[in-house]
C-alpha cells in the first residue's frame, strides 16, 4: 500500500512581498520564504518577523500561515527643542519615504548640523540627507542687540531694553556680572565667582532685566563653576576667566540673547582706539551700585601704554599681562567699576553685524575712571580653546 503526499496550495505572495523559490508545485518538505520589498517588513499578526519560511506538510498544508509585508513606520518624530517639525508628505505621515522638515524658531535660533530635512528610511529611522539619525540642533543666534552701533559705567548712560540681552546679574556674596553664552553657559571673571567654585548652587543668576532690584527677571541657577586653572586668587588677575554652567537652558528672546565669542578675525575690530562697550550695575560716579543697567563706550588703549600705567606702585611689576587688554580714556571719566566684574566688554563685528565679547571686566585702579589709568579686561580671544573645551566636555 502506498500513498502520495498532497501538494500544498500555491503560495500567493502578500502585497509588497515575493516568494522564493518559485516552483511549479510544492510537495512534502518543500519550502518557500517570503521577502518584503525595501521599506516593508514581515508581520505575523502584530508581531514583526526577522524572516519567514513555511514548509509543506504531509497533509498538503503549509506549517505556517502567510505573513504580511507591512510598510515600515518611523513613528512620530522627536520634538526639536526651540524648533518644530513639519510633515511634508502629508499630515502625520511617518511611513517609508515620508519627508519631514525640522526648523528652528525664527530670529533667535539657527539650525546646526544639517538642513533639517529627514526621510523615513527602510530601517525605521528618520534620516537626514547626510545620513544622520540624530536630531538637528537649534543653536541660539548670538550677538543680536537693539543697539546698531557703538556710540558715544562710570560716566555711562542708561541701557534700554534689548541693548545688552546677554547681560547677566550674579548675586552670591557680592554683586557681579557675566555674559550669556549659548543658552546654558555664563562667561564671567574668575575673581567674581571664586568663593562659590565649590558651591555653585549658591549663585543667584538673573537675566532679562534692566533694573538690578526688579522682581521681573528670568531666574537661572548654576550647576557648576569652572575657574581657569591658571588663575591664582589674591595673586594678580592673570587668567581671570570662569564659566558657569546653568542647570537649565534659558529661552532666548529679544531680552535674553547670548553674546558671540570672537572669531579668529576679531582682533581687527579690537585695535587701539577701537570702541568697545562695557555694561553693568557697578558703582557709578555717585559711589553707589547702579539701579538701572548702565553702559559706557570706551576705546581700547595701546597695550604698552597700559602696562606702563600699572608699572608704578602700588601695582606690582607685570600686573598687566598678554592675557589682558585695557580700555578707557587717558583723561579718565569713563570706566567700568566694582560690581561690574565679570561683565562683557563687547565689540561690533561689522562683517557679521553681530556683537562679540572681547574682554571681561577684571580689574583697574582703586579709583574708577581715574586719569592716566585704565580698566583692565581679560582678553577673551586668548581663551577660545579653553572655553570650547569646557563647553564641549561638559
Amino acid at each position: 500500500y502506498t500513498s502520495t503526499a498532497q501538494p500544498c496550495p500555491y503560495p500567493m505572495a502578500p502585497p509588497n512581498g515575493h516568494v522564493s523559490p518559485v516552483q511549479a508545485k510544492y510537495i512534502l518538505k518543500d519550502s518557500f520564504s517570503i521577502f518584503c520589498e525595501t521599506g516593508y517588513e514581515l508581520l505575523q499578526g502584530h508581531l514583526p518577523l526577522k524572516s519567514f519560511t513555511a514548509v509543506c506538510q504531509k497533509d498538503g498544508s503549509w506549517d505556517r500561515p502567510m505573513p504580511a509585508c507591512s510598510i515600515v513606520d518611523c513613528g512620530p518624530p522627536d520634538d526639536l527643542p526651540s524648533g518644530r517639525v513639519e510633515y511634508i508628505t502629508g499630515p502625520g505621515v511617518t511611513t517609508y519615504k515620508a519627508v519631514i522638515q525640522y526648523s528652528c524658531e525664527e530670529t533667535f535660533y539657527t539650525m546646526k548640523v544639517n538642513d533639517g530635512k529627514y526621510v523615513c528610511e527602510a530601517d525605521g529611522f528618520w534620516t537626514s540627507s547626510k545620513g544622520e539619525k540624530s536630531l538637528p540642533v537649534c543653536e541660539p543666534v548670538c550677538g543680536l542687540s537693539a543697539r546698531t552701533t557703538g556710540g558715544r559705567i562710570y560716566g555711562g548712560q542708561k541701557a534700554k531694553p534689548g541693548d545688552f540681552p546677554w547681560q547677566v546679574l550674579i548675586l552670591g556674596g557680592t554683586t557681579a556680572a557675566g555674559a550669556l553664552l549659548y543658552d546654558n553657559w555664563v562667561l564671567t571673571a574668575a575673581h567674581a565667582v571664586y568663593e562659590q567654585k565649590h558651591d555653585a548652587s549658591a549663585l543667584d543668576i538673573r537675566m532679562g532685566t534692566l533694573k538690578r532690584l526688579s522682581p521681573h527677571y528670568t531666574q537661572a541657577w548654576s550647576e557648576a563653576v569652572f575657574i581657569h586653572e591658571g588663575y591664582t586668587h589674591d595673586a594678580g588677575f592673570d587668567n581671570d576667566i570662569a564659566l558657569i554652567k546653568l542647570n537649565n537652558k534659558v529661552v532666548i528672546n529679544s531680552n535674553i540673547t547670548p553674546i558671540c565669542l570672537p572669531r579668529k578675525e576679531a582682533e581687527s575690530f579690537m585695535r587701539t582706539d577701537d570702541i568697545g562697550t562695557a555694561s553693568g550695575w557697578g558703582l557709578t560716579q555717585r559711589g553707589f551700585l547702579a539701579r538701572n543697567l548702565m553702559y559706557v563706550d570706551i576705546p581700547i588703549v595701546d597695550h604698552q601704554k597700559c602696562t606702563a600705567a600699572y608699572e608704578k606702585p602700588p601695582y606690582p611689576r607685570g600686573s598687566v599681562t598678554a592675557n589682558m587688554l585695557c580700555a578707557g580714556l587717558e583723561s579718565g571719566g569713563k570706566d567700568s567699576c566694582r560690581g561690574d566684574s565679570g561683565g562683557a566688554l563687547v565689540f561690533l563685528d561689522s562683517e557679521t553685524e553681530r556683537w562679540f565679547v572681547g574682554g571681561i571686566v577684571s580689574w583697574g585702579s582703586m579709583n574708577c575712571g581715574e586719569a592716566g589709568q585704565y580698566g583692565v579686561y581679560t582678553k577673551v580671544i586668548n581663551y577660545i580653546p579653553w572655553i570650547e573645551n569646557i563647553i564641549s566636555d561638559f
Epitope: 507591512s70 513606520d73 512620530p76 502629508g90 499630515p91 502625520g92 505621515v93 511617518t94 522638515q101
Partner: antibody, heavy 116, light 111 residues
Framework: DVQLVESGGGLVQPGGSRKLSCAAS????????IHWVRQAPEKGLEWVAY????????FYADTVKGRFTISRDNSKNTLFLQMTSLRSEDTAIYYC?????????WGQGTTLTVSS | DIVLTQSPASLAVSLGQRATISCRAS??????????IHWYQQKPGQPPRLLIK???NLESGVPARFSGSGSGTDFTLNIHPVEEEDTATYYC?????????FGGGTKLEIK
Amino acid sequence: DVQLVESGGGLVQPGGSRKLSCAASGFTFSNFGIHWVRQAPEKGLEWVAYISSGGSAVFYADTVKGRFTISRDNSKNTLFLQMTSLRSEDTAIYYCAKSDRYFDYWGQGTTLTVSS
Amino acid sequence: DIVLTQSPASLAVSLGQRATISCRASQSVSSSSYRYIHWYQQKPGQPPRLLIKYASNLESGVPARFSGSGSGTDFTLNIHPVEEEDTATYYCQHSWETPWTFGGGTKLEIK
C-alpha cells in the same frame, strides 16, 4: 487651556467668497499642524484642508481643491480659510482642529450658509 | 480615497450594557507599528471630542469604559458599561493618507 475660536461664517451667495479665521491660544501654535473640518446640516464630518506647522505644506480635499486656500499667521496665532466660487454644498459648520496625526482639540465651529 | 464604513448606523443599548461599533476600511490603515484609526464622540450642538487614538490608545480624560481594538482594515469601539451621558454620534477617522476620511457615524441611544 487650549482654545480654538472660529469666525467669519454667515450667509453668502453662490459663486461668492468668504474668509474664515480661527484664533488659537493655550498652546504653541507654530509647533502644530492645523486642519479645517466641516459638517453639513444633519450630515457627517468631512476633512477639508490641512496646513503644516510652518505653513510650507498644505493639503486639500478634492471637493475644495482650487477653490479654497488654507493659510496661517504664526505671529498672530491665527489660521485662515479663504473660500471662493462657493456652492450650496459648501453649506456647513466649519471647525478648525489641532494636531498633525489626529484631531485632539476642536473649535466650536462657525456656520457658513451658501444660498441665493 | 480610503472609505470607512461604520456599522450599525444606529443602535440602542440598555443602560449598563455593552455597545459595539464597527469600522471597516477599504484598505489597510495599519503600518508595522501604528494603526491609524481614531474615534470621536459628538453630542448635538457640540464639536467632536477625541476618544481613542491609534485604534486603542485612550485619550487623557476619557473614561476607561471606552476601549478600541482592531488592525489592518477592521476596527471596533466598545463602550461598557454604557451610561446615559454616552448618548451621541460616534465617528471613526483614518489618518493613513490624505484625504483623511471619516466613517458615516453611528448614533448611540441609551434605552
